[in-house]
Interface confidence: low
């Protein structure tokens, strides 16, 4: 069966939107009005992985682009990147682990934990227009909570 996907945008707990900042970078900033059209639309695919009631494995691709968020080691540190893939082969049900995030729902907020690097989360900075990154702390200065908006 084909992999089930939905289109959505994400905002962090400070209501910052995610936009492209270079071919392989995302940044988070506050957008209003027409500028909201700049925000990235994700194609969230429901993939194979450990699943529970509040933890669902997903892959986060960019809608209409063959780019996926992935987690790799760079200089011995878990790092978030946008990785290009062959559009003929993605998305697929059994995604490589670096593409998989555990979508965790807590109090109507979402966290995205790397399946490759447990306890590392998609994160944003408090500061405006800074890169989206993989962070190893929850509940600290950096933001790991998101809300999801469905896009038709």
């Amino acid at each position: 069966a084909p992999v089930r996907s939905l289109h959505c945008t994400l905002r962090d707990a400070q209501l910052k939107s995610l936009v492209m900042s270079g071919p392989y970078e995302l940044k988070a900033l506050h957008l209003q009005g027409q500028d909201l059209e700049q925000q990235v639309v994700f194609s969230m695919s429901f993939v194979q992985g450990e699943e529970s009631n509040d933890k669902i494995p997903v892959a986060l691709g960019l809608k209409a682009k063959n780019l996926y968020l992935s987690c790799v080691l760079k200089d011995d540190k878990p790092t978030l990147q946008l990785e290009s893939v062959d559009p003929k082969n993605y998305p697929k049900k059994k995604m490589e682990k670096r593409f998989v995030f555990n979508k965790i729902e807590i109090n109507n907020k979402l966290e995205f934990e790397s399946a490759q690097f447990p306890n590392w989360y998609i994160s944003t900075s408090q500061a405006e227009s800074m890169p989206v990154f993989l962070g190893g702390t929850r509940g600290g200065q950096d933001i790991t909570d998101f809300t999801m908006q469905f896009v038709s």
Partner: antibody, heavy 118, light 107 residues
Framework: EVQLVQSGAEVKKPGESLKISCKGS????????IGWVRQMPGKGLEWMGI????????RYSPSFQGQVTISADKSISTAYLQWSSLKASDTAMYYC???????????WGQGTMVTVSS | EIVLTQSPATLSLSPGERATLSCRAS??????LAWYQQKPGQAPRLLIY???NRATGIPARFSGSGSGTDFTLTISSLEPEDFAVYYC?????????FGQGTKLEIK
């Protein structure tokens, strides 16, 4: 049809300024990076810089940083390459090209020949 | 800064023969490598992206392989229109350099 159409050939004198253009059509111009590539007579391809028209985020090759300026006007789907003071060594063919998400320049303009001579 | 070195500089072959062009990176570029063909008086044309994927409309006689630092463009059986200059190109962070080119000429 997806295409990039560049402005015509230019003949200039050393010290003059110049701005050449690259107009995109047939696709969402703001969704793709546009790169500029130089080819000096009888030589190979040299990447100069790249711009994302949506927000004009621009990155330059160190070899061209400070030598040229890359800009874009998304309202008319056009990217630009400009010089404030041309040198004879700027004589070359200049191509614009669309940069895809799979790490390649897939659509190329026809090229603009710039000749700088006194 | 990553440097791409293509070899040979010139390759002389006859139609129907197999052509093998090499591109070596000074450090690993994963699979972020593309190949282009350029004929005299024309703009370059994308042949291969991500090391091994043929671009739209490119004949099956063109194939790419390799990863890391060593990449190969193979033309299985040369047609008269294949004689041209071939360039490899890669991305590393915000650098997009090209190799110096291989001229494929008729023997």
């Amino acid at each position: 049809e997806v295409q990039l159409v560049q402005s015509g050939a230019e003949v200039k004198k050393p010290g003059e300024s110049l701005k050449i253009s690259c107009k995109g059509s047939g696709y969402s111009f703001t969704s793709y990076w546009i790169g500029w590539v130089r080819q000096m007579p009888g030589k190979g391809l040299e990447w100069m810089g790249i711009i994302y028209p949506s927000d004009s985020d621009t990155r330059y090759s160190p070899s061209f940083q400070g030598q040229v300026t890359i800009s874009a006007d998304k309202s008319i789907s056009t990217a630009y390459l400009q010089w404030s003071s041309l040198k004879a060594s700027d004589t070359a063919m200049y191509y614009c090209a669309r940069y895809t998400n799979w790490d390649a320049f897939d659509i190329w303009g026809q090229g603009t020949m710039v000749t700088v001579s006194s | 800064e990553i440097v791409l070195t293509q070899s040979p500089a010139t390759l002389s072959l006859s139609p129907g023969e197999r052509a093998t062009l090499s591109c070596r990176a000074s450090q690993s570029v994963s699979s972020y490598l593309a190949w282009y063909q350029q004929k005299p008086g024309q703009a370059p044309r994308l042949l291969i992206y991500d090391a091994s994927n043929r671009a739209t409309g490119i004949p099956a006689r063109f194939s790419g392989s390799g990863s890391g630092t060593d990449f190969t463009l193979t033309i299985s059986s040369l047609e008269p229109e294949d004689f041209a200059v071939y360039y490899c190109q890669q991305r590393s962070n915000w650098m997009f350099p090209f190799g110096q080119g291989t001229k494929l000429e008729i023997k």
